[in-house]
Interface confidence: low
């Protein structure tokens, strides 16, 4: 054998983040040499799954008919090939949304805003969270994610934007959660629809910090000024 | 308790056909593999066949593949195996297990106390 | 199918005694070897996985180690709720396979 066989591919359709009760198919593409595959879950006691392959034996199949909070994790899957196992794959984040009760998502001081003006979105909880998402539409990394300090559970986050430019504008949505498992969200808040108007042109906006090596406006995230302060923490959906 | 109940052994005649219980309790049943074992009066253990949790894969060992079928009702929490077209080397005792499947390990961390079938004229 | 030999068939041993017993697969299975005790009128329990990882709760006397087709099984301090029948398995390739068993008696 000339070195450990290559690492599967990894994902899930119709994709990662899936609202309570809905199904997901995972499925983990290795090689045609493949004779079984197997897939776990991290800090499951439960193993997690293994099939036979599909044909022509590249590829197997995991089906979840029905989420709940037990399938939400981390998960890696791996091939037996007739020399050996596989390397594990990279992992996939599967998350539940519906864990609980949605937010209320707002703009301060309001969703039209002026190009180069200030605009704060507000997630707010019925029940005290400690981690806050937003989600930006059609985004490529919609991500932002607010946790409070030292684990202290509060009722909203806000996520300042300054300056506004047309690519702030577009659908937003919240989500909240808690510190103990990251993979299980609240319901999405409504959408809020933000609208930028005006001449004040800024081709990228400048956060306060960046955290990504994003290519293009779309992939800058929005960076907290207020009082949650961010966790460092960021996951990319697709 | 993670228990399991094997039943629906007794005496059949050979050429005969018998179908085995194993109803399952205390774990999430239909998220496992579940498989049937089987062991002859003072012999070794022999792996008769497994089941996925949605059965959609089913595996046997070889020389059982056209006698016996494995089944599961995941609404009842229960596993079946019918036997068809039974011989006297079929009589042991029948147990139903739980494997654990992870990554490059695989064993049979859950096992029901058995039940026996014997072939007899 | 990978066959799994064990040997010997029976033991004799006494309490204290350290036992070693030897089983060995038909071509290669890398370390997929599990160990189990059954006792009399009881279903098999798990002792070892994965050739030489101890199972929850199970004593540390008990040890397995090996690779590829030859792997052991050792009781250090033999104790009297030891005797039983152990059986080796290979989770290396489907069907999955037993050795014939070892018996542990009393001298």
């Known amino acids: 054998q000339a070195g450990p066989l290559p690492k599967p591919t990894l994902w899930a359709e119709p994709g990662s983040v899936i609202s309570w009760g809905n199904s997901v198919t995972i499925w983990c593409q290795g090689t045609l040499e493949a004779r079984e595959y197997r897939l776990d879950k991290e800090e499951s006691p439960a193993p997690w799954d293994r099939q036979n392959p599909l044909e022509p034996k590249n590829k197997a199949r995991f089906s979840i008919p029905s989420m709940t909070e037990d399938y939400a994790g981390r998960y890696r899957c791996y091939y037996r090939s007739p020399v050996g196992w596989s390397q594990p794959s990279d992992p996939l984040e599967l998350v539940m949304t519906g864990a609980y009760s949605k937010p209320t998502l707002s703009a301060l001081p309001s969703p039209l805003v002026t190009s180069g003006k200030s605009v704060t979105l507000l997630c707010q909880s019925r029940s005290p969270m400690d981690t806050f998402l937003l989600i930006k539409e059609r985004a490529a990394h919609p991500l932002l994610h607010l946790r409070s300090e030292h684990g202290a559970q509060q009722h909203q986050a806000e996520f300042p934007m300054s300056p506004v430019t047309s690519v702030h504008g577009g659908t937003y949505r919240c989500f909240s959660s808690h510190g103990f498992s990251h993979y299980l969200l609240s319901h999405p808040s409504d959408p809020l629809e933000l609208i930028v108007s005006g001449s004040l042109e800024d081709p990228r906006p400048s956060p306060t910090r960046s955290v990504s090596t994003a290519a293009g406006p779309e992939d800058q995230p929005l960076m907290p000024t207020g009082s949650v302060p961010h966790s460092g923490l960021r996951r990319h959906w697709e | 308790e993670v228990k399991l109940l094997e039943s629906g052994g007794g005496l059949v005649q050979p050429g005969g056909s018998l179908k085995l219980s194993c109803a399952a309790s205390g774990f999430d049943f239909s998220r496992y593999w579940m498989i049937w074992v089987r062991q002859a009066p003072e012999k070794g253990l022999e792996w008769i066949g497994e089941?996925?949790?949605?059965?959609?894969?089913?595996n046997y060992t070889p020389s059982l593949k056209d006698k016996f079928i494995i089944s599961r009702d995941n609404a009842k929490n229960t596993l079946y195996l019918q036997m068809s077209k039974v011989r006297s080397e079929d009589t042991a005792l029948y147990y139903c297990?739980?494997?654990?499947?992870?990554?490059?390990?695989?064993?049979?961390?859950?096992w029901g106390a058995g039940t026996t079938v014997t072939v007899s004229s | 199918d990978i066959v799994m030999t064990q040997a010997p068939k029976v033991l004799l041993v006494s309490a204290g005694d350290r036992v070693t017993i030897s089983c060995k697969a038909s071509?290669?299975?890398?370390?997929?070897v599990v160990w189990y005790q059954q006792k009399p009128g009881q279903s098999p329990k798990l002792l070892i996985f994965y050739a030489s990882n101890r199972y929850t709760g199970v004593p540390d006397r008990f040890t397995g180690s090996g690779y590829g087709t030859d792997f052991t099984f050792s009781i250090s301090t033999v104790q009297a709720e030891d005797l039983a029948v152990y059986f080796c398995?290979?989770?290396?390739?489907?069907?999955?396979?037993f050795g014939g068993g070892t018996k542990l008696e009393i001298k």
């Open positions: 398995q290979q989770d290396y390739s489907s069907p999955w396979t």
């Open positions: 297990a739980r494997p654990y499947y992870r990554y490059d390990v695989g064993y049979f961390d859950v």
């Open positions: 071509q290669s299975v890398s370390n997929a």
């Open positions: 089941i996925n949790p949605d059965s959609s894969t089913i």
